[in-house]
């Protein structure tokens, strides 16, 4: 149940895909990754107001309970709904290798 | 890559399963659910400090970038890693029906 995509907080304020440029040093990968030297990291950032991109029934419950008990129950959180793979050239015991990571770059986002 | 389960913030402060008691009225279900009248909602609540229960590579990246750019990149968030099903007796056009919801109760938690 992927609920409404209209953001009541204003354009770009709600849960959506953002791109953050990061170097291998930023990521703490400089000692084991050779390439790429810089990664365009796609990640899910933004608020999750009532029923906005609710991932499932659990997210809907969380919204209801957060409204009732905001100090106990946090609002739903903006997280990846799916991922794009990314291939790294990484150091190994014997030299270097290509390795695909399936859970590295967010592809789209929802609230949960 | 499910990283460390030791919470550096103190017992019970980090991402874990909590149970919140909620009535049908609390959940906004009173008009379409007959039973149960009260739900022990299991949900994921708590902080996600560095590498605590990191769900995957994306979560590890998020931790690194949050440390560097806390105003831009949020910390990882405590969300369900899996769910327990729940059966509801619900009203239908023709009477009542048993319906299983697979994504209603959190079973365990991780940070993403």
């Amino acid at each position: 149940a992927r609920n409404g995509d209209h953001c009541p907080l204003g354009p770009g304020r709600c849960c959506r895909l953002h791109t953050v440029r990061a170097s291998l040093e930023d990521l703490g990968w400089a000692d084991w990754v050779l390439s790429p030297r810089e990664v365009q990291v796609t990640m899910c950032i933004g608020a999750c107001p009532s029923q906005f991109r609710a991932a499932n029934m659990h997210a809907q419950i969380k919204t209801s309970l957060h409204r009732l008990k905001p100090d106990t129950v946090p609002a739903p959180c903006c997280v990846p709904a799916s991922y794009n793979p990314m291939v790294l050239i990484q150091k190994t015991d014997t030299g270097v290798s290509l390795q695909t990571y399936d859970d590295l770059l967010a592809k789209d986002c929802h609230c949960i | 890559a499910r990283n460390g389960d030791h919470c550096p913030l103190g017992p019970g402060r980090c991402c874990r399963l909590h149970t919140v008691r909620a009535s049908l009225e609390d959940l906004g279900w009173a008009d379409w659910v007959l039973s149960p009248r009260e739900v022990q909602v299991t949900m994921c609540i708590g902080a996600c400090p560095s590498q605590f229960r990191a769900a995957n590579m994306h979560a590890q990246i998020k931790t690194s970038l949050h440390r560097l750019k806390p105003d831009t990149v949020p910390a990882p968030c405590c969300v369900p890693a899996s769910y327990n099903p729940m059966v509801l007796i619900q009203k239908t056009d023709t009477g009542v029906s048993l319906q299983t919801y697979d994504d209603l109760l959190a079973k365990d938690c991780h940070c993403i």
């Epitope: 050779l34 390439s35 790429p36 030297r37 794009n84 793979p85 990314m86 291939v87 790294l88 050239i89 190994t92 015991d93 014997t94 030299g95 270097v96 290798s97 290509l98 390795q99 695909t100 770059l105 | -």
Partner: antibody, heavy 121, light 110 residues
Amino acid sequence: EVQLLESGGGLVQPGGSLRLSCAVSGFSLSSYDMTWVRQAPGKGLEWIGIISNSGSTYYASWAKGRFTISRDNSKNTVYLQMNSLRAEDTAVYFCARGILVYADYGDHNLWGQGTLVTVSS
Amino acid sequence: DIVMTQSPATLSVSPGERATLSCQASEDIYTNLAWFQQKPGQPPRLLIYAASTLASGIPARFSGSGSGTEFTLTISSLQSEDFAVYFCLGVYTYISAEGAFGQGTKVEIK
């Protein structure tokens, strides 16, 4: 001694299939990525694809769908399965150790001598 | 698709002279580049990897430079055994990985 030896080449009709083998000796195949490259007579080198040490495969866009790289670490052998062969696939096919743009430890230049595939009716 | 473009196609040089070969990538490949030398009937021989690192057993007259999309192979003083065809190879990685060779530069005796 570290060696790579390609085999399985020969004459095949257009539309046919062929499986090339690259038998390695002197090192443990399971630790290394392996690359296939081809060279048409009198032409340049053409990158076909790589199989990583974990078994992931990566192909040139023109090779996707027709060519498949696999490996059997227990037999210390890498394979190149070629389907729907065309006259323009006529070439010497080489296997090489590593991803080539970065060197593995030890010997930096491990190529087989190649095996000739001729596609003709 | 990644495309590697080498120039010139043919380079005529006298022994003892300097030779400069260029390779351009259609994508930013950082230093994911190697240079190979090939002589007739032989497999390619690795000269330079990681854009600028000399492979073992290769004479110091060979050097590589560049990163991103522009790369150069320099042979400081050509010897008779250096007359051959030279290929660059680039590997681009992001959501997938793909490699491509340049079309080659033939270094011939002037």
